[in-house]
Interface confidence: medium
């Protein structure tokens, strides 16, 4: 089979594929699984030994416009007595996701896929000790 | 949809909400370049609720390979390095958006898909249910 020219993929392209201008892709932002719900254990952000708070960031030129960010409440971790133990560290767990960014250039609008970094929660870790030589 | 401010001098035909289908520049912009990846890639071993990473592959999705976290223990690791079953390791889950090729096999036509991934684990105090 002949290798297709750049701009095509390497499997047979079905005849029904929508035409797309060069340098761009057609993206349907009607989300598959839109109504899927996170079934995380109840209020783990408060019950964790590395608890965190949530804040919502809002950007009208981003899709989705609402992104929730977590922030660790403490530097250390909460021990069995409910006190902060600074011999351990609360650290953020981060996750990248894709968003669609809308850009206005004069009267025209362009769209760009973008990776954004979301802090999802926190975990308690043993610190790395750096010994000074 | 979401409403956005529009340049008042522009013709009124433009929808203020995000349209259902958009033409998107092919290259994916990385807003996190100064912090990416800021991760300490050994958190999954150093955590009191450690996790393993499992490969999930789907050739019709971008990214095709996603590594999912699975907590190693039901309990958490205590100061002696043993599993303490008075505490629970639980996954931290997050919905992320990925690209799904739609219709399948079409080279430049995609749909956003929301998927639930386990990113890591955290140690929590268990919820104790008292039997009446």
């Amino acid at each position: 089979r002949k290798i297709p020219k750049v701009g095509h993929t390497f499997f047979q392209k079905p005849e029904s594929c929508p035409p797309v201008p060069g340098g761009s892709m057609k993206l349907d932002i009607g989300i598959i699984n839109e109504n899927q719900r996170v079934s995380m254990s109840r209020n783990i952000e408060s019950r964790s030994t590395s608890p965190w708070n949530y804040t919502v960031t809002w950007d009208p030129n981003r899709y989705p416009s609402e992104v929730v960010q977590a922030q660790c409440r403490n530097l250390g971790c909460i021990n069995a007595q409910g006190k902060e133990d600074i011999s351990m560290n609360s650290v953020p767990i981060q996750q990248e996701t894709l968003v669609v960014r809308r850009k206005h250039q004069g009267c025209s609008v362009s769209f760009q896929l973008e990776k954004v970094l979301v802090t999802v929660g926190c975990t308690c870790v043993t610190p790395v000790i750096h010994h000074v030589q | 949809g979401i409403t956005i401010p529009r340049n008042p001098g522009c013709p009124n035909s433009e929808d203020k909400n995000f349209p259902r289908t958009v033409m998107v520049n092919l290259n994916i912009h990385n807003r996190n370049t100064n912090t990416n990846p800021k991760r300490s890639s050994d958190y999954y071993n150093r955590s009191t609720s450690p996790w393993n990473l499992h490969r999930n592959e789907d050739p019709e999705r971008y990214p095709s390979v996603i590594w999912e976290a699975k907590c190693r223990h039901l309990g958490c690791i205590n100061a002696d390095g043993n599993v303490d079953y008075h505490m629970n390791s639980v996954p931290i889950q997050q919905e992320i958006l990925v690209l799904r090729r739609e219709p399948p096999h079409c080279p430049n036509s995609f749909r956003l898909e929301k998927i639930l991934v386990s990113v890591g684990c955290t140690c929590v105090t268990p919820i104790v249910h008292h039997v009446a």
Partner: antibody, heavy 126, light 107 residues
């Protein structure tokens, strides 16, 4: 284990074209990117361009634009690099390299080259 | 395009010694800087990704640091097998570019 196996050494005449292949095994071929990097004798590494199979697009370094074409065939998990209008300056070892394009531990792990082919030596001489 | 400069060009080192190679970018590239080792007549091998993140199978004596424009590769306790040329690579902005390389040989 991921392996990238390249086609054999080539001797070419100035003005002719070159097409070398890179056969991938062990891993999601469609999911990762393949870049081509060359190294002239005694010189450093020079990125020529790369393709992301999932999207089917290729990016090229300005220096090679119009002269290089990078393609891939998913059915044979093989990437190709074609370079036209060869001159003696194109004498080099040509490497294919994998960009993982994975979602690892919360991050897109991408845009570095974690596996390399063994290299294809190309000599352009009359 | 982003220009990467490495120093030194060449270093002759005794085994067990500490080696430090620096890489400077012509503009801010965040942490999108990777390090490779190339031994004579071999393909390059990834050592460090994203400035400071270790790579599976690479000995722990190799470490990286830095962000923005200034980066460092450190080999703590050089071994004879570490002889070769070390390249930095930026992937923040296309085209990908590489540093000119630092040749390390064993005394």
């Amino acid at each position: 284990e991921v392996q990238l196996v390249q086609s054999g050494a080539e001797v070419k005449m100035p003005g002719s074209s070159l097409k070398i292949s890179c056969k991938a095994s062990g891993g999601s071929f469609r999911g990762y990117g393949i870049s081509w990097v060359r190294q002239a004798p005694g010189q450093g590494l020079e990125w020529m361009g790369g393709i992301t199979p999932f999207f089917g697009w290729a990016d090229y370094a300005q220096k090679f634009q119009g002269r290089v074409t990078i393609t891939a065939d998913e059915s044979t998990t093989t990437a190709y690099m074609e370079l036209s209008g060869l001159t003696s300056d194109d004498t080099a070892v040509y490497y294919c390299a994998r960009d993982p394009n994975e979602f690892w531990n919360g991050y897109y792990d991408t845009h570095h080259f974690d596996y390399w082919g063994q290299g294809t030596t190309v000599t352009v001489s009359s | 395009e982003i220009v990467l400069t490495q120093s030194p060009d060449f270093q002759s080192v005794t085994p067990k010694e500490k080696v430090t190679i620096t890489c400077r970018a012509s503009q801010d590239i965040g942490s999108a800087l990777h390090w490779y080792q190339q031994k004579p007549d071999q393909s390059p091998k990834l050592l460090i990704k994203y400035a400071s993140h270790s790579v599976s199978g690479v000995p722990s004596r190799f470490s990286g640091s830095g962000s923005g424009t200034d980066f460092t590769l450190t080999i703590n306790g050089l071994e004879a097998e570490d002889a070769g040329t070390y390249y930095c690579h930026q992937s923040d902005i296309l085209p990908h570019t590489f540093g000119p390389g630092t040749k390390v040989d064993i005394k």
